[in-house]
């Protein structure tokens, strides 16, 4: 669809005569009839297949035509067509004399014709005017013409219909060739697809209007590139939604079980070395001079009774010092200056000469020891405390300080590892010689039944339209991550326009 436009510029009829040569009285009141038709090698009479148009009286004899409305007529003249422009045409322009006001063909005498011109040729659609001038014996007509497309029609033949729009069905304007030109922020064949916020994750995000980024279930962040961990996940992260991958030193389904008590709580004192030995369990290796579960107790260096032969021990800042009884010397009073003649054996010990009387040895009665039978037997020397318990002399008696997991007078009893109910999710606990064992109920596994091995809710492929399925471990249900263009719990519905706000 388009318009053939004809712009009449000047008509010269100096003598004011008709085609017959007869003069007009009082002058030639001139109007024009235009016939546009298909291309003919020789332009002949017949139907004006592309259309006709007539002007009002534009002037008398010779005159210029203004390029706007003139006496109710339009200049340029419009010859609309509702077909593909063929690129060729024939044009007939007749100048007529109007003796009266009735310009209809049947109201005019046949000899009222002033002049008639006929041209034919090819003409491409375009904005540029073609200027032409036709001269006969008595008249001259100057005019220009062109073909342009109607509103919303484009292309070389005005055959491409394109109407700009900005609604749900498209967001575009039209290019000169009739192709769509998407408005900023839109893309796709019909410019219906919004261009999301720059960087918005292709799978995890989508948008319903330009420059936004809406996150699919389980994702968050400005670009929907951060997964949301399993609800209740304490010390863990995720790489896909609803995961809970534990940070170093944490375990359990929700990463809330402390496997690195040493690092998280630093229980060992006085520079001791800490070793993790299970959930919330640890062992401290004390530096010399310290004792206790957490190495919190300072040992006196005299506690080991380093002074011999009845020497008395004195604690000092940098160690200890032995005060030797008469007849003894040395760091630990280990050297004697006595012989049996000096009766060196205490507590009923009997003396035996050695090295021709230069030395001696005491044979002690039961419950006494030492080179001079000066010490009561240390009840701890026989290591009576089992399972690594620490023996402590307490006056006439002794006691054992047990390591974690043991009890009894001699630490001989194993504390049940099951007493702490270590098996998660209703697992059954069995005490073993070196620890424990959990028998897990259906749906759980792992050393402590902490790993959920429930049926994969995604196994039945419940998501439609190539959506990605995720299993929600807390509920044994599935979540469908929909591709662009689909919504619904199973991505079964084509997308509409989602509301922007929950109000």
């Amino acid at each position: 669809s388009g318009v053939f436009q004809l712009q009449l510029q000047e008509f010269i009829n100096e003598r004011g005569v008709l085609a017959s040569g007869r003069p007009c009285e009082p002058g030639c009141r001139t109007f024009f009839r235009v016939c546009l038709k298909h291309f003919q090698a020789v332009v002949s009479p017949g139907p004006c297949t592309f259309g006709t148009v007539s002007t009002p009286v534009l002037g008398t004899n010779s005159f210029a035509v203004r390029d706007d409305s003139s006496g109710g007529g339009r200049n340029p003249l419009q010859l609309p067509f509702n077909f593909t422009w063929p690129g060729t045409f024939s044009l007939i322009i007749e100048a007529w004399h109007a003796p009266g006001d009735d310009l209809r063909p049947e109201a005019l005498p046949p000899d009222a014709l002033i002049s008639k011109i006929a041209i034919q040729g090819s003409l491409a659609v375009g904005q540029n005017w073609l200027l032409d001038e036709q001269t006969s014996t008595l008249t001259r007509l100057r005019y220009s013409y062109r073909v342009i497309c109607s509103d919303n029609y484009y292309g070389d033949n005005c055959s491409r219909l394109c109407k700009k729009r900005n609604d749900h069905f498209g967001h575009y304007v039209c290019q000169p060739d009739g192709n769509l030109s998407c408005l900023p922020g839109w893309t796709g064949e019909y410019c219906q697809q919004p261009i999301c916020l720059s960087g918005c994750h292709e799978q995890n995000g989508y948008c319903s209007k330009p420059a936004e980024c809406l996150c699919r279930p389980g994702w968050q962040g400005r670009l929907c590139n951060e997964c949301i961990p399993h609800n209740g996940c304490r010390h863990g992260t995720c790489s896909t939604p609803w995961q809970c991958t534990c940070d170093e030193g944490w375990g359990g389904l929700f990463c809330d079980q402390d496997l690195n008590y040493c690092t998280h709580h630093s229980p060992c004192k006085n520079g001791a070395t800490c070793s993790n030995s299970g959930q919330r369990s640890y062992t401290c290796t004390c530096r010399p001079g310290y004792t206790g579960v957490d190495c919190e107790l300072e040992l006196s260096e005299c506690d080991s009774n380093p002074c011999r032969n009845g020497g008395s021990c004195k604690d000092q800042e940098d160690g200890y010092h032995c005060l030797c009884p008469p007849g003894y010397y040395g760091l630990h009073c280990e050297h004697s200056t006595l012989s049996c003649a000096d009766s060196p054996c205490f507590n009923g010990g009997s003396c035996r000469e050695r090295n021709q009387g230069a030395n001696y040895a005491c044979e002690c009665p039961p419950n006494f020891t030492g080179s001079n039978c000066e010490k009561k037997v240390d009840r701890c020397t026989s290591n009576p405390c089992a399972n690594g318990g620490q023996c402590l002399n307490r006056g006439p008696s002794r006691m054992c300080r047990c390591r974690p997991g043991f009890t009894g007078t001699y630490c001989e009893l194993h504390v049940s590892d099951c007493a702490r109910n270590p098996c998660a999710h209703g697992g059954t606990c069995h005490d073993l010689e070196n620890g424990l064992m959990c028998t897990c109920p259906a749906g759980f596994s792992g050393r402590r039944c902490e790993v959920r091995t429930s049926i994969d809710a995604c196994a039945s492929s419940p998501c439609f339209n190539r959506a990605t399925c995720y299993t929600d471990l807390s509920t044994d249900t599935f979540v469908c991550n929909c591709p662009y263009g689909f919504v619904g719990s199973r991505c079964e519905f084509p997308v509409g326009l989602p509301p922007s706000f929950p109000w």
């Epitope: 948008c207 936004e212 980024c213 996150c215 968050q220 929907c224 949301i228 609800n231 922007s500 929950p502």
Partner: nanobody, 123 residues
């Protein structure tokens, strides 16, 4: 059941300060980005500020930038909004919410919502 409960709103003179709190329960607060949204009488909702799950990244609307400060304490499951140099145009109901969708300037779609707390700034 997810709950977001805002508090700390009230009537304050222009130029004054308020601190809003949002107590979260029923979900792992420390795993979610959070934001503050406000709605003035007769107007649509307006995004105010947002903070990522760890608390290290913050965003502000131009209208409050430099005056408001968003923060969070994941050990207390609480979101905060410190509002200084308040203006009469800050008068609105303030909501805390979990952002679900972002536009070029900030969040505009949300998952969980609180019930809101009224802030009125008199001139």
């Amino acid at each position: 059941e997810v709950q977001l409960v805002e508090s700390g709103g009230g009537l304050v003179q222009s130029g004054g300060s308020l601190r809003l709190s949002c107590a979260a329960s029923g979900f792992t607060f420390g795993s979610y980005d959070m934001s503050w949204v406000r709605q003035a009488p007769g107007k649509g909702p307006e995004w105010v500020s947002a903070i990522n799950s760890g608390g290290g990244i913050t965003y502000y609307a131009d209208s409050v930038n430099g005056r408001f400060t968003i923060s969070r304490d994941n050990t207390k499951n609480t979101l905060y909004l410190q509002m200084n140099s308040l203006k009469p145009e800050d008068t609105a109901v303030y909501y805390c919410a979990t952002p679900r969708g972002w536009g070029p300037t900030g969040p505009h779609e949300y998952g969980y919502w609180g019930q809101g707390t009224q802030v009125t700034v008199s001139s």
